[in-house]
Interface confidence: medium
């Protein structure tokens, strides 16, 4: 999916409310400095590309994050305010329901939100240049 | 399996409310996030509002301020509580989950 018409003033302010603060609550007690972040991205159709992929695709040792507030939070903001998002997604979004993993926090999942909170910073800040 | 129910439409002059309810079976409110949509005659169906399980709202700027989305979790349902309705905002009215699993809509009609 090109995220290139996206609302992003309206991602923006759907992440500062709201799902910034289920980020947060999902790696709380743990350290900001405990992972480094490994993922960036260099422009905001980019930065989402990079959320939904680490969101919703399964990695290995993390496979529950789309059943999480924060992950179905992005989905309804990308399919409100990306034209045509929720038609590509329906095929995913049959094949997440055969599967229905219960949801499990492992280390790996937090690393992987770690990077997701890098990632929706940087989305904030189109203008700063890439480090 | 999913299933939706949306009632509370009907005929109302401009300017006047009227409030929609969506129950719901086979999810749990608190888990999930659900939205309104709506569809007028001729048109695509879009976006109205959206509550989340947490209590966290967004609404479309053509509603902000005179529509509200809620829910009772206990009860399962969502609300749409329309304030100083327009003839523009005839349309036949949706309730959807994240998955989008759809209700089969009710009818509200502003005319006077």
């Known amino acids: 999916y090109d995220f290139t018409n996206c609302d992003f003033e309206k991602i923006k302010a759907a992440y500062l409310s709201t799902i910034s603060k289920d980020l947060i609550t999902y790696m709380s007690g743990t350290k900001s400095t405990e992972f480094n972040n490994t993922v960036s991205c260099s422009n905001r159709p980019h930065c989402l590309t990079e959320i939904q992929s680490l969101t919703f695709n399964p990695t290995a040792g993390c496979a529950s994050l789309a059943k999480e507030m924060f992950a179905m939070k992005t989905k309804a903001a990308l399919a409100i305010w990306c034209p045509g998002y929720s038609e590509t997604q329906i095929n995913a979004t049959q094949a997440m329901k055969k599967r229905r993993k219960r949801k499990v926090t492992t280390n790996k999942c937090l690393e992987q939100v770690s990077q997701l909170q890098g990632l929706w910073r940087r989305f904030n800040r189109p203008l700063l240049k890439q480090q | 399996e999913v299933q939706l129910v949306e009632s509370g439409g009907g005929l109302v002059q401009p300017g006047g409310s009227l409030r929609l309810s969506c129950a719901a079976s086979g999810l749990t409110f608190s888990t999930t996030v659900m939205g309104w949509f709506r569809q007028a005659p001729g048109k695509e169906r879009e976006w109205v509002a959206t509550?989340?399980?947490?209590?966290?709202?967004f609404y479309a700027d053509s509603v902000k301020g005179r529509f509200t989305i809620s829910a009772d979790n206990s009860k399962n349902t969502a609300y749409l509580q329309m304030n100083s309705l327009k003839p523009e905002d005839t349309a036949v009215y949706y309730c959807?989950?994240?998955?989008?699993?759809w209700g089969q809509g009710t009818l509200v009609t502003v005319s006077s």
């Open positions: 509550i989340a399980g947490d209590g966290s709202t």
């Open positions: 959807a989950d994240i998955n989008e699993d």
